[in-house]
Interface confidence: low
Amino acid sequence: RRRRRDTHFPICIFCCGCCHRSKCGMCCKT
């Protein structure tokens, strides 16, 4: 499950449920 980007969502975060593979981890989105 990917979280929807918004203006407050940083490009890279340590997060849960936002990566394409990890449930939690350091996730970078381009």
Partner: antibody, heavy 124, light 106 residues
Framework: QVTLKESGPGILQPSQTLSLTCSFS??????????VSWIRQPSGKGLEWLAT???????GYNPSLKNRLTISKDTSNNQAFLKITSVDTADTAIYYC????????????????WGQGVMVTVSS | DIQMTQSPSLLSASVGDRVTLSCKAS??????LNWYQQKLGEAPKLLIY???SLQTGIPSRFSGSGSGTDFTLTISSLQPEDVATYYC????????FGAGTKLELK
């Protein structure tokens, strides 16, 4: 070719601040989706993830050590840094830096490329 | 923190043996598990990521399986160069490593 190399003080005393440097080549921390992590391994023991920094300066820390850790980077010199405050003998370990796998902009904590490690001893 | 328990801690096997290493998580980590090989004096090397994906350049005798809390690393035919310590690593939440399984030749 991706390479990483750690450097540090070798020996320091309890209560001091440990400063570590990871110098790398073959990739840039200004590239989208690239991150660098620090991991340590006490002599003869297991591995412990410490911190991760990514290309646009976001950071993740091990919760149990977060108040003692600071990760940073110097993009132009291809370096990442880790500071650990108030060190104790329990911080004696080999310290590794590593680069997680990168999936075209998605970088997670699947640590792929590792440096050879630097031994740090805390002793009075 | 999620605890990772590896068994056995020491395993002796012969060349050509099929070897199975176990890793158990204290709670559900889905498939967010890697296996690393560490030879004496060297840095860890990624063998398997996301439970069963073989990292590039790793021999096909290595395979991984599992889901949830129980995971396995299998070496289908043990080779002398496989002598090492093997660590599992979860990155589902607050990344943690297991204590390792030391694999030696009989």
């Amino acid at each position: 070719q991706v390479t990483l190399k750690e450097s540090g003080p070798g020996i320091l005393q309890p209560s001091q601040t440990l400063s570590l440097t990871c110098s790398f080549s073959g990739f840039s921390l200004s590239t989208s989706g690239i991150c660098v992590s620090w991991i340590r391994q006490p002599s003869g023991k297991g591995l412990e993830w410490l911190a991760t920094i990514c290309w646009e300066d976001s950071k993740g820390y091990n919760p149990s050590l977060k108040n003692r850790l600071t990760i940073s980077k110097d993009t132009s010199n291809n370096q990442a840094f880790l500071k650990i405050t108030s060190v104790d003998t329990a911080d004696t370990a080999i310290y590794y830096c590593a680069r997680p796998l990168n999936y075209g902009g998605y970088s997670e904590l699947e640590l792929d490329y590792w440096g050879q490690g630097v031994m740090v001893t805390v002793s009075s | 923190d999620i605890q990772m328990t590896q068994s056995p801690s020491l395993l002796s096997a012969s060349v050509g043996d099929r070897v199975t290493l176990s890793c158990k998580a204290s709670q559900n980590i889905y498939k967010y598990l890697n296996w690393y090989q560490q030879k004496l004096g060297e840095a860890p090397k990624l063998l398997i990521y996301y439970t069963n994906s073989l990292q590039t350049g790793i021999p096909s005798r290595f395979s991984g399986s599992g889901s949830g809390t129980d995971f396995t690393l299998t070496i289908s035919s043990l080779q002398p160069e496989d002598v090492a310590t093997y660590y599992c690593y979860q990155y589902n939440s607050g990344p943690t490593f297991g204590a390792g399984t030391k694999l030696e030749l009989k």
